[in-house]
Interface confidence: low
């Protein structure tokens, strides 16, 4: 691994030589310091590929965490950067150097070398946590094939800076709870699991809290085994709709399938006053189905333009693959246009919607 951004050292950098393997170096840094840990190869010989680990979880390079083969830099350190750091040989996982790092709230003494105007935190924005990128958190159900990498993200802010923890099915979730471990990335707003397996299925909750409050977000992970199964349809879709006469309506259906799915939109109809046939199968008409030039994305949306009262009723999204079928239904209610309501009212009728 190469450092890539070797010159990005700001503020006070305390370079610490690595202890003998087996020893633990105790280090204290001030808030805002640049923590720099050095781990030269034992005996000066070649070291081979290495990984830096904090509290049992592999560190991933970022603009703040600069990872090199023999050196680790953590810029603008905060309390959350306290912990047990080690440099390990990638292949053998042998610990080459081990450091215990504590970051205190008070900045350590020493002049700022980068000339940066450090504005005081006046505490004006003191408050409970909030999501900083809610648009990045809209995917509540993640259905991925086995062996893929999954990332859940909960970018948040608050003052004081909130902490984040992760739960799986309501219980504390840590790296040692799964083979392959987990990665907490970028100020720990993300949880990454590589090479997911069926046992990783479940509900993952990020809990972001400070002394003023707590917010949480739950994601559902489904791992699609290579032994294929019928399509999965996202819960709550399509959703029931109410529309005014003459308006446009869209129904959405999100399909997850390892095997190639075939998607159809159906409308339930009556035949001779009956909604189902003699065998109990509903009467339907196919509104939309795969064609030569239709993409799955297009099929996941059913658009109805200039709706009439005849368009009211039950709609079904049907998805099938080589294994089987899944379907979700929703209802469309069509209301009269406002002018019609007014006219009816003037004529002495009452419309109860």
């Amino acid at each position: 691994e190469s450092l890539g951004t070797e010159q990005r050292v700001v503020g006070r950098a305390a370079e610490v030589p690595g202890p003998e393997p087996g020893q633990q170096e105790q280090l204290v840094f001030g808030s805002g310091d640049a923590v720099e840990l050095s781990c030269p190869p034992p005996g000066g010989g070649p070291m081979g590929p290495t990984v830096w680990v904090k509290d049992g979880t592999g560190l991933v390079p970022s603009e703040r965490v600069l990872v090199g083969p023999q050196r680790l830099q953590v810029l603008n350190a905060s309390h959350e950067d306290s912990g047990a750091y080690s440099c390990r040989q990638r292949l053998t996982q042998r610990v080459l150097c081990h450091f215990s790092v504590r970051v205190t709230d008070a900045p350590s003494s020493g002049d700022d070398e980068d000339g940066e105007d450090e504005a005081e935190d006046t505490g004006v924005d003191t408050g409970a946590p909030y999501w900083t990128r809610p648009e990045r958190m809209d995917k509540k159900l993640l259905a991925v094939p086995a062996a893929n990498t999954v990332r859940f993200r909960c970018p948040a802010a608050g003052n004081p800076t909130p902490s984040i923890s992760w739960l799986k099915n309501g219980r504390e979730f840590r790296g040692e709870h799964r083979i392959g471990g987990i990665k907490l990335r970028h100020q720990q707003w993300s949880l990454v699991m590589e090479s997911v397996v069926p046992s990783d299925r479940g509900n993952y909750t990020c809990v972001v809290e400070n002394k003023f409050g707590s917010i949480r977000q739950t994601y559902t992970l489904d791992v699609l085994e290579r032994s294929p199964h019928r399509p999965i349809l996202q819960a709550g879709l399509p959703a029931n709709q109410t529309a005014v006469l003459g308006s446009d309506v869209e129904f959405h259906c999100k399909v997850y399938s390892d095997a190639q799915p075939h998607i159809q939109w159906l409308k339930h109809v009556e035949v001779n006053g009956s909604k189902v046939g003699p065998d109990g199968t509903p009467y339907v008409t196919v509104l939309k189905t795969a064609g030569a030039n239709t993409t799955d994305k297009e099929l996941e949306v059913l658009s109805l333009h200039n709706v009439t009262f005849e368009d009211a009723g039950e709609y079904t999204c049907l998805a099938g693959n080589s294994i089987g079928f899944s379907h979700h239904s929703a209802w469309l209610v069509v209301l009269p246009a406002e002018e019609e309501l007014v006219e009816a009212d003037e004529a002495g009728s009452v419309y109860a919607g």
Epitope: E116, A119, D121, P155
Partner: antibody
Framework: QVQLVQSGAEVKKPGASVKVSCKAS????????IHWVRQAPGQGLEWIGD????????SYAQKFQGRATLTADRSTSTAYMELSSLRSEDTAVYYC?????????????WGQGTLVTVSS | DIVMTQSPDSLAVSLGERATINCKSS????????????LAWYQQKPGQSPKLLIY???TRESGVPDRFSGSGSGTDFTLTISSVQAEDVAVYYC????????FGGGTKVEIK
């Protein structure tokens, strides 16, 4: 060495669509957000939007909402920007650029740019 | 949207002289929790793609000469070239990344 290599120049008629590609190499594609920025002749830089290649999640500048579509193909480490209903004022150099994901960062690498000319 | 306003539009400087470019944001880009200003400066030479010079308002990107420096906090920022060289002829843009992304209009630096 990180590289963002963009597709070649395009000439389009008003009302048409254009799709520009941006192939990333030298780093893990899914560890970054890909942003698109354009620059009309003799003008400044204008942010179009960004995509997280891992989840496909996108953000757009209000001006381009509904007209720009950002996509990414993880298998080829390629990001795409499609702009529809082209007008003459869309004539510009379109750049892809990247930032670290998960938190706002500056744009540290840029593609070479793709000139899109809209003319009848 | 946060609006970024740069001044001046253009600047003619003698070689070796100091050049100062100002950038004002319509709202603060300082995030009090981490005391960072979400502001970057870019350099764009004629016929080239923009290049990142400074991020977090004052941190120089790797490989950028130390004659370039950034300062300021909140809504008012400055890019300073302490001793302008011929290769510094370019358009300079400020950009906020506090809320989505917006750029300033650019400042053209020329040699007198």
């Amino acid at each position: 060495q990180v590289q963002l290599v963009q597709s070649g120049a395009e000439v389009k008629k008003p009302g048409a669509s254009v799709k520009v590609s941006c192939k990333a190499s030298g780093d893990t594609f899914t560890d970054f957000e890909i942003h698109w920025v354009r620059q009309a002749p003799g003008q400044g830089l204008e942010w179009i939007g960004d995509i997280d290649p891992e989840t496909g999640s996108t953000s757009y500048a209000q001006k381009f909402q509904g007209r720009a579509t950002l996509t990414a193909d993880r298998s080829t480490s390629t990001a795409y920007m499609e702009l529809s209903s082209l007008r003459s004022e869309d004539t510009a150099v379109y750049y892809c650029t990247r930032t670290y994901d998960g938190y706002p960062y500056a744009m540290d690498y840029w593609g070479q740019g793709t000139l899109v000319t809209v003319s009848s | 949207d946060i609006v970024m306003t740069q001044s001046p539009d253009s600047l003619a400087v003698s070689l070796g002289e100091r050049a100062t470019i100002n950038c004002k944001s319509s709202q603060s880009v300082l995030y009090s929790n981490n005391n960072k200003n979400y502001l970057a400066w870019y350099q764009q030479k004629p016929g080239q793609s923009p290049k990142l010079l400074i991020y977090w308002a004052s941190t120089r990107e790797s490989g950028v000469p130390d004659r370039f420096s950034g300062s300021g906090s909140g809504t008012d920022f400055t890019l300073t070239i302490s001793s302008v060289q011929a290769e510094d002829v370019a358009v300079y843009y400020c950009q906020q990344y506090y809320s989505y992304r917006t750029f300033g209009g650019g400042t053209k630096v020329e040699i007198k």
